[in-house]
């Protein structure tokens, strides 16, 4: 058993049929010694008397809010949550495995630049009685500060018969140094509580590995005289790190016909313009990637070839 917050405790249980559970001793936070009784949740049934209460915690029915009273007055509370371990592995019932980039990926994180600001998100099918708390640091042995906001519901989707809820959180490294080589990873820890079930999820990464630039902006076409060619131009996204001479992007320009089966013409360039042939009913798309480190490509910015 360990204390999550003041008056909130997590009981770690090996979860298998007929498991013996954990013996837990609760102590009433009071100088009183006599006339103390204990109840669980809304029930008025007296579970025991005295300054301490010893309980055997085996299942969710044994968890909840234990309250000690004297003469009708509440003296203190202890909320017990359960953390299940099945076959030596902590349960992951609350969040959905996103399976990308690999199995057992519950948290996914992205950064638009090297400022130390990043966003993480996760999925669940649970709609109520669900609370998250997010903490983060750079490194774990001598952690440097990262401040995370509140987890918020960012999307709802229908997946077959189920609704799926996406939560996200924004974090900012307190003393970020965009140009520095990272030697310690960012650690993100999400505590999740559904009713009386506690779980925790972690992710560890370098900002450079989760970089995904925003799409190029101001994508424009300029037809070249007496030619089927056009000059495509664009700009770095506003959210990308500056100066661009140091934080450079490379670009992929694609000409895509109306039909997905049509051959795609692709050009790679470090410049912010390119000359391509614009076919009828085609569209031109441009995406960006860090020039010197092979992290994710941005989404496409597109314009029609009309």
């Amino acid at each position: 058993i360990w204390e999550l917050k003041k008056d909130v405790y997590v009981v770690e249980l090996d979860w298998y049929p007929d498991a013996p559970g954990e013996m837990v001793v609760l102590t009433c936070d009071t100088p009183e010694e006599d006339g103390i009784t204990w109840t669980l949740d809304q029930s008025s049934e007296v579970l025991g008397s005295g300054k301490t209460l010893t309980i055997q915690v085996k299942e969710f029915g044994d968890a909840g809010q234990y309250t000690c009273h004297k003469g009708g007055e509440v003296l203190s509370h202890s909320l017990l949550l359960l953390h299940k371990k099945e076959d030596g592995i902590w349960s992951t019932d609350i969040l959905k495995d996103q399976k990308e980039p690999k199995n057992k990926t519950f948290l996914r994180c992205e950064a638009k630049n090297y400022s130390g600001r990043f966003t993480c998100w996760w999925l669940t099918t649970i709609s109520t009685d669900l609370t998250f708390s997010v903490k983060s640091s750079r490194g774990s042995s001598d952690p440097q500060g990262v401040t995370c906001g509140a987890a918020t519901l960012s999307a709802e989707r229908v997946r077959g018969d189920n609704k799926e809820y996406e939560y996200s959180v924004e974090c900012q490294e307190d003393s970020a140094c965009p140009a520095a080589e990272e030697s310690l990873p960012i650690e993100v820890m999400v505590d999740a509580v559904h009713k009386l079930k506690y779980e925790n999820y972690t992710s560890s990464f370098f900002i450079r590995d989760i970089i995904k630039p925003d799409p190029p902006k101001n994508l424009q076409l300029k037809p070249l005289k007496n030619s089927r060619q056009v000059e495509v131009s664009w700009e770095y996204p506003d959210t990308w790190s500056t100066p661009h001479s140091y934080f450079s992007l490379t670009f992929c320009v694609q000409v895509q016909g109306k039909s997905k089966r049509e051959k795609k013409d692709r050009v790679f360039t470090d410049k912010t313009s390119a000359t391509v042939i614009c076919r009828k009913n085609a569209s031109i798309s441009v995406r960006a990637q860090d020039r010197y480190y092979s992290s994710s490509w941005s989404e496409w910015a597109s314009v029609p070839c009309s």
């Epitope: 999550l4 917050k5 003041k6 008056d7 909130v8 109840t39 949740d41 809304q42 809010q65 309250t67 509440v74 509370h77 909320l79 949550l81 709609s127 109520t128 009685d129 669900l130 609370t131 998250f132 708390s133 509140a150 987890a151 918020t152 519901l153 809820y165 939560y167 505590d191 509580v193």
Partner: nanobody, 126 residues
Amino acid sequence: EVQLVESGGGLVQAGDSLRLSCTASGRTFSSHTMAWFRQAPGKEREFVGTIVRIFGDTYYADSVKGRFTISRDNAKNTVYLQMNSLKPEDTAVYYCAAALRGTSSDWRAAATYDDWGQGTQVTVSS
């Protein structure tokens, strides 16, 4: 059900401080998320801040961030709103609210809260 009673309101000068209290009767107080809302005359009820069940994390409206602080004392079944550097635009009736259900996403929404106090008037004069 939790019964909530607010106290500590009054008339203060701009720049002054005030501490509001909300006392709950009901045994499951510490497993509730507790929030403060406010309503100025002729305006919608507005989220001020919340202290979340279990984790004890606090979240605030941008308009009060850095000036207001929410805390709770589970043994006394009381939640507090410490208001510093008060401004005339903070004038409103302040309500305490309690939610047993809900998710991390909707602590700012009035509809999340099941139980409400009667409110206490705070007037900030310039």
